[in-house]
């Protein structure tokens, strides 16, 4: 009879075991769907929010035709300055032709000076080659003005109007770039 | 958080090709870039290639031409597509996910370039 009630309570203590398991990885679920949907609110308040302003480019940003440029307030050297606008979803300034160098040097003129930017062109060590970032090749017309003697990593920067070569490990402002979002009206 | 998870590494001959993946799991919608860095044995990691979510690509001077950077949005993965490699392209490939705060590496994956 002692041994029919101690196996009793031995099952009873098990189904408790397993009640409290089960609850616990309710609670569990419930705490990662409320997570998820806190998530899921932010994500929706930022696309909501993008929509509601509708503009092309972020704030502090400059457009023009399709594209925006943000300009930066700090120095880096060439490597860090890239990966500052990977950080905003965008490259280092690719310049496509004359008119977009025009009005590059033109708002900088505005904003800031005549001070030294990154852009995102550099020279290949071993052939000597200017490339842009996405490996495409300067226009003939837009390649820096003069060759750096360094024997480190060279890279293009806009000063004034012109387009110029230096040490990457120098500090300089930089101008990043991103596509302008399309109005959807 | 954004967790990261490569694969694809492993070893080939000089001239050969390999394709790594990086796929994506976690507060994604918080990523403006991701990109692939190495580090070889006693160097510095260093970027190889990145892209951003309009699909911008940017990459090394030393694997222009060689290597190609992709996304799938649809699978949240990037991919590396390494052609002609050389020894010099041996090393450990992260994957990294660029926001506007914290930047999320994945734990890499071993690339050997040997005959």
């Known amino acids: 009879k002692l041994l029919q009630v101690s196996t009793i309570a031995m099952q009873q203590q098990e189904k408790l075991i397993q009640q409290e398991r089960a609850l616990l990885n309710f609670t569990e679920w419930k705490r990662s769907c409320a997570l998820q949907m806190k998530y899921c609110q932010a994500f929706m308040q930022n696309s909501l929010s993008s929509a509601h302003n509708s503009s092309p480019c972020p704030n502090n940003w400059i457009q023009n035709r399709e594209s925006c440029y943000y300009v930066s307030e700090i120095w880096s050297i060439w490597h860090t300055s890239q990966e500052n606008c990977l950080k905003e979803g965008s490259t280092l300034l690719q310049i496509e032709s004359k008119e977009e160098m025009d009005f590059i040097t033109g708002s900088l003129r505005k904003i800031k000076g005549s001070y030294d930017y990154w852009v995102g062109l550099s020279q290949d060590g071993h052939s000597g080659r200017w490339l842009w970032q996405d490996g495409s090749s300067p226009s003939p017309g837009l390649l820096p003005a003069e060759r750096s003697q360094s024997a480190n990593q060279v890279c293009g920067y806009v000063k004034s109007n012109s387009l110029l070569s230096s040490n990457c490990s120098t500090w300089k402002y930089f101008i990043c770039e991103k596509y302008a979002l399309r109005s959807s009206v | 958080d954004v967790q990261l998870v490569e694969s694809g590494g492993g070893l080939v001959q000089p001239g050969g090709s390999l394709r790594l993946s990086c796929a994506a799991s976690?507060?994604?919608?918080?990523?403006?870039?991701m990109g692939w860095y190495r580090q070889a044995p006693g160097k510095q990691r260093e970027l190889v290639a990145a892209?951003?979510?309009?699909?911008?690509?940017t990459y090394a001077d030393s694997v222009k031409g060689r290597f190609t950077i992709s996304r799938d949005n649809a699978k949240n993965t990037v991919y590396l597509q390494m052609n002609s490699l050389r020894p010099e392209d041996t090393a450990v490939y992260y994957c990294?996910?660029?926001?506007?705060?914290?930047?999320?590496w994945g734990q890499g994956t071993l690339v050997t370039v040997s005959s």
């Open positions: 892209i951003t979510n309009q699909g911008a690509p």
């Open positions: 976690g507060r994604i919608f918080s990523v403006n870039a």
């Open positions: 990294k996910a660029f926001t506007r705060g914290d930047d999320y």
